[in-house]
Amino acid sequence: QNCSGPCRCPDEPAPRCPAGVSLVLDGCGCCRVCAKQLGELCTERDPCDPHKGLFCDFGSPANRKIGVCTAKDGAPCIFGGTVYRSGESFQSSCKYQCTCLDGAVGCMPLCSMDVRLPSPDCPFPRRVKLPGKCCEEWVCDEPKDQTVVGPALAAYRLEDTFGPDPTMIRANCLVQTTEWSACSKTCGMGISTRVTNDNASCRLEKQSRLCMVRPCEADLEENIKKGKKCIRTPKISKPIKFELSGCTSMKTYRAKFCGVCTDGRCCTPHRTTTLPVEFKCPDGEVMKKNMMFIKTCACHYNCPGDNDIFESLYYRKMYGDMA
């Protein structure tokens, strides 16, 4: 973004920011904008919340266009009302082992997070909490009648994991990598993050990737076949170009996206991979960003609920699939 030109702001007055979000000047000192929050995409024009000690991490110097809002080195984490130092590991509950790093929390599930797809012998699999057990287990009860308004859109559930074995030992380093967070958006371009020490110096670092669970403009319900209640992985009719803050992917992609259900189930990524995507900006600059690509989706009743403070945080905010 060139800040040398005259300042001109959008025609509408200053935006009203949600509670807890600062109204700040953009990076050119021109216009008032709502500050981006931890883990959100940021640009010079869309700065991070300085009152929360956040800065826009652009990654490599070549990519000084779009970054991710990151807490300054050593920033503590507030989690479930407790403050954790950067670098500190803690067990948030019997289900998750977590690490605080520069204001971000990355967690690894201690319970199996497998997806159970419907089968003839178990048409309606459901995870339930059994007395005296920490981890939920799958049961095959008939589902309770569910009244649902509209399709269930979700970006939130854990997926099968690929990549380094979390317990791999390499050159005096216990390699640990948290799950990728769930995509920050249920539709459109979002961000997914994780914490890992899978690097030469065995130091914990945050990684981020772009993600798109489904395009926002797609009316996926229309594609559900008569008599069916879900469309798990809708066919995208033509290759698409991804857009990111005014920049467009240089290649077209025949990407897979997750569909929707009309019976209360959520369709979310099941297997994913991470690949680099090059974006070309209007000024000719090219930047490379890692992006999640969906291999398969799953539709399930294991939608995020609010009964477990950590579970809802886990599914809704930070953590999700592994590439």
Partner: antibody, heavy 119, light 112 residues
Framework: EVQLVESGGGLVQPGGSLRLSCAAS????????MAWVRQAPGKGLEWVAN????????DLLASLKSRFTISRDNAKNSVYLQMNSLRAEDTAVYYC????????????WGAGTTVTVSS | DIVMTQTPLSLSVSLGDQASISCKSS???????????LEWYLQKPGQSPQLLIY???SRASGVPDRFSGSGSGTDFTLKISRVEAEDLGVYYC?????????FGQGTKLEIK
């Protein structure tokens, strides 16, 4: 009623200094950029400087940057133009103007204050 | 610097007639946000300037609809469909898309 009132003009010798003030009323001052525009005797209009909502960004005519400074005090609903090392060619009527920062630039103008640089 | 050139420099019009003023910029005045900040101001005798038109063709609050602006790229026009006595004064075009912000040299409208 929206109003801008300039003050601080007068006769000054070359090399001297003046500080112009502009008092605003009738609108939420911190919601607007402010600007100074000048008009030499018998001549056209010339943009001098503008300043953002909080004073953290200022833009000035390049040829005046080393001598002129624009500032504001939102608590006093006022904008200022500090003029140093004045020259004969700085002689003009100096107008304070409200800049919407959005659709239009100068939607409200003051009556102006006259600065004369002469020995 | 972008030079704004107005023609004619003076204009004598009978009441009720149409007046047209041209303004040409020495280069494109499209801002990096893709909008064009071309404005017209009127300075009546002994008064401060007042905003008439902004963003090429939008009328400022309280400006009569006999004033209209048009144009794109580098060529812009202000039209007064039926000139009234109160319209006399000097008309300035202005570009706010690039630094330094610049005014045209002015067009003096007189009533015949």
């Amino acid at each position: 009623e929206v109003q801008l009132v300039e003050s601080g003009g007068g006769l000054v010798q070359p090399g001297g200094s003046l500080r112009l003030s502009c008092a605003a009323s009738g609108f939420t001052f911190s919601d607007y950029y402010m600007a100074w525009v000048r008009q030499a005797p018998g001549k056209g209009l010339e943009w001098v400087a503008n300043i953002n909502y909080y004073g953290s960004r200022t833009d000035l005519l390049a040829s005046l940057k080393s001598r002129f400074t624009i500032s504001r005090d939102n608590a006093k609903n006022s904008v200022y133009l500090q003029m140093n090392s004045l020259r004969a060619e700085d002689t003009a009527v100096y107008y304070c103007a409200r800049d919407t920062s959005r659709g239009s630039y100068f939607d409200v103008w003051g009556a102006g204050t006259t600065v004369t640089v002469s020995s | 610097d972008i030079v704004m050139t107005q023609t004619p420099l003076s204009l004598s019009v009978s009441l009720g007639d149409q007046a047209s003023i041209s303004c040409k910029s020495s280069q494109s005045i499209v801002h990096y946000n893709e909008k064009t900040y071309l404005e017209w101001y009127l300075q009546k005798p002994g008064q401060s300037p007042q905003l008439l038109i902004y963003k090429v063709s939008s009328r400022a609050s309280g400006v009569p609809d006999r004033f209209s602006g048009s144009g794109s790229g580098t060529d812009f026009t202000l039209k007064i469909s039926r000139v009234e006595a109160e319209d006399l004064g000097v008309y300035y075009c202005f570009q706010g898309s690039h630094f330094p912000l610049t005014f045209g040299q002015g067009t003096k409208l007189e009533i015949k």
